[in-house]
Every structure is written in structure tokens, then in C-alpha cells.
Interface confidence: low
């Protein structure tokens, strides 16, 4: 397929990636699906520099990212290795808290009001950020 060399309308370019910032809220799975339908994925944070960029754009609002542990280990949606990668959890997080009374633990990660990460119930309707890489063939299937 032909390579994408510039970001779609309403997306923000940064360091050879394009980002789209929602202004409404969805459950994590719905946000994940939204990004896939845009040939993108929920944002994968690989550096402190990228963390600061995303944080600047979302402000002090709970916002989903592409990190979850719904099958056991924490995993990034694009296959980036979690254990060796960048992390920015709040102290004592992730805690897989069961005390919220909603059933189950907390399996999806989000940016908190100060930008640091927390794990929360995946059904909560938070904002989200999609990311897609420039120079990726535009006709490739989305990263699942």
C-alpha cells in the first residue's frame, strides 16, 4: 500500500506519529475498537518525551491508553514489551483493586489528572487517545 506521509485531518503530528484526542468518553474496549477502525491503536507510551506530549494535550482528565492486563500480564496493544518499556505509574499502582464493588479487578490503564498512570475498571467511560505511525503503509490492517 501507499505510505502515509502526513497526518489525517484533526490528528496531531509528533515524532513521526499521529495522535487523535477524544472529547467524549467510552469504555476501554469501545475506545480500543474506535482506534482500530481508524487504522490506529490506543496510544502506546514509549518515552518520557511522549508522555509529556500526550499529557499536555489531554490536560487533567482521566484518559485511556493502550495498556491492559485483561489476560494476566500487562501488555501494550501494539506488542511493545511492557516489562522493558517506559512506565509512569502512580505510587502503589497498579493495584488491581477489587473494592470498587463493580465486579472483578482493574485491568485497564489510564492517565490520571496529573498524568501518572492508574489501573481502573475497563468499563469506565473515560476519554481516550488514538495513535498511528507515519510511514506505515496506509492499506495495512490496523494493529490489533
Amino acid at each position: 500500500g501507499s505510505e502515509r506521509t502526513c497526518c489525517p485531518v484533526n490528528w496531531v503530528e509528533h515524532e513521526r506519529s499521529c495522535y487523535w484526542f477524544s472529547r467524549s468518553g467510552k469504555a476501554w474496549a469501545d475506545a480500543d475498537n474506535y482506534c482500530r477502525l481508524e487504522d490506529a491503536h490506543l496510544v502506546v507510551v514509549t518515552s518520557w518525551e511522549e508522555q509529556k506530549f500526550v499529557q499536555h494535550h489531554i490536560g487533567p482528565v482521566n484518559t485511556w491508553m493502550g495498556l491492559h492486563d485483561q489476560n494476566g500480564p500487562w501488555k501494550w496493544v501494539d506488542g511493545t514489551d511492557y516489562e522493558t518499556g517506559f512506565k509512569n505509574w502512580r505510587p502503589e499502582q497498579p493495584d488491581d483493586w477489587y473494592g470498587h464493588g463493580l465486579g472483578g479487578g482493574e485491568d485497564c490503564a489510564h492517565f490520571t489528572d496529573d498524568g501518572r498512570w492508574n489501573d481502573d475498571v475497563c468499563q469506565r467511560p473515560y476519554r481516550w487517545v488514538c495513535e498511528t505511525e507515519l510511514d506505515k503503509a496506509s492499506q495495512e490492517p490496523p494493529l490489533l
Epitope: N71, P73, K75, D78, G79, T80, E83, T84, L144
Partner: antibody
Framework: EVQLVESGGGLVKPGGSLRLSCAAS????????MNWVRQGPGKGLEWISS????????YYADSVKGRFTISRDNAKNSLYLQMNSLRAEDTAVYYC????????WGQGTLVTVSS | DIQMTQSPSSLSASVGDRVTITCRAS??????LAWFQQKPGKAPQSLMS???GLQSGVPSKFSGSGSGTDFTLTISSLQPEDFATYYC?????????FGPGTKVDIK
């Protein structure tokens, strides 16, 4: 350079116990999930246990659950596998490996369970 | 548990051949697949993670592809040092599981 070195293998009778160690160097040990994987003679690879960097997440294969215990000492850059109630079918080379995708492996230590 | 199958179980090839090994998961595992090479009497060595991410120091003659349930490992031009057994492994879910291996030997 990342290095993983296993030790503690040997010959043990059925029902006996053994403690394996894995000494890690060349990386910040406490940041990484670690695993034990084994390979029986002439057999394929079998994952048996995993422990997160802070020891908060621990998982076992059904074949060893209740008999084996994984642990780590981040101050000593060491991973351990305590093996109790050993059976003949536990005979294998035991490897420690780093992260969920097993990017680095030790050389292995042989455990033989036989009377 | 997620079952991993590999085909073929063994193959004979000549130096310079292009070799493709396939791995199939019993359910979708996204990109959470790794490939390993093992030579007799030695520990496995990581070739690939995230289905197509070449491990540091691994030559580019190795390539990986796939997502979901079907994956391939390709060796573009087989060299004498590549004769070994190759395993795939899923890390989408516990328990982590390996394929049974594909033995590549000299024709």
C-alpha cells in the same frame, strides 16, 4: 551484557526437594519479570512459572502448582525456584528467562528425579 | 489454555534455500508471539518478539509476520549455522505456551 546463570540442579529421589537459583547481571534486575522454563529429555519447551519485578504477580503452570514456589531477591539480583514433592516427570533442564517474551535465557541446569 | 501448533514438524533444506515455518494459535493472540532457535545441547535463543520484532543482534535474514492466530517465521537464505529447531511461543495469556518445534536439517 545481559547474563543469566542457573545453579542448584542435581540428582534427587522422587518426593525430594531442590532449590534452583538464577544469578542475573547486566541489567536492572528489579525492573523485569522473570520466568522458569524447562525442557524434558528429547522434549519441547514448557513454561512453568513467572514472577513480576516487585513479586506482586506470580503465576504457575498447572503441572507444578502447589509443589513449586518461585521467588526473587532483588538486592541479590537472584531468582529462585523451590521444588518440592519432585516426580520423575520433573526431570528436565531448567532455564531462567527474562520477560514474557523470554528475550534472554540462562544456560540451564539439569534436574534428574530418579530412585 | 492456548494451544500452539507448528508446521512442518521437520524439514530438510539446502544452504541458500528460503525456509518458512508456520505457527498457529488456538485462539487470537494479537501480536504476542515470540520465535526461538535452539541447537542441540544449548539453551534457546530469542529471534523475534511481538511477531515481527527482530531481537537485537539477530541477522536480518530472519523475518516474522502475522497477527491473531496465524504466524510465520522466514529464513531468507539458509546458512549452515541455521540448522536447528525453531519454537514459537505465545505470551498473550498465562500459561505461556510453546509450539512443539520445527526441526530444520540438511538435505
Amino acid at each position: 551484557e545481559v547474563q543469566l546463570v542457573e545453579s542448584g540442579g542435581g540428582l534427587v529421589k522422587p518426593g525430594g526437594s531442590l532449590r534452583l537459583s538464577c544469578a542475573a547481571s547486566g541489567f536492572t534486575f528489579s525492573n523485569y519479570r522473570m520466568n522458569w522454563v524447562r525442557q524434558g529429555p528429547g522434549k519441547g519447551l514448557e513454561w512453568i512459572s513467572s514472577i513480576s519485578g516487585s513479586s506482586t504477580d506470580i503465576y504457575y503452570a498447572d503441572s507444578v502448582k502447589g509443589r513449586f514456589t518461585i521467588s526473587r531477591d532483588n538486592a541479590k539480583n537472584s531468582l529462585y525456584l523451590q521444588m518440592n514433592s519432585l516426580r520423575a516427570e520433573d526431570t528436565a533442564v531448567y532455564y531462567c528467562a527474562r520477560v514474557a517474551s523470554f528475550d534472554y535465557w540462562g544456560q540451564g541446569t539439569l534436574v534428574t528425579v530418579s530412585s | 489454555d492456548i494451544q500452539m501448533t507448528q508446521s512442518p514438524s521437520s524439514l530438510s533444506a539446502s544452504v541458500g534455500d528460503r525456509v518458512t515455518i508456520t505457527c498457529r494459535a488456538s485462539q487470537g493472540i494479537s501480536h504476542y508471539l515470540a520465535w526461538f532457535q535452539q541447537k542441540p545441547g544449548k539453551a534457546p535463543q530469542s529471534l523475534m518478539s511481538a511477531a515481527s520484532g527482530l531481537q537485537s543482534g539477530v541477522p536480518s535474514k530472519f523475518s516474522g509476520s502475522g497477527s491473531g492466530t496465524d504466524f510465520t517465521l522466514t529464513i531468507s537464505s539458509l546458512q549452515p549455522e541455521d540448522f536447528a529447531t525453531y519454537y514459537c511461543q505465545q505470551y498473550q495469556n498465562y500459561p505461556f505456551t510453546f509450539g512443539p518445534g520445527t526441526k530444520v536439517d540438511i538435505k
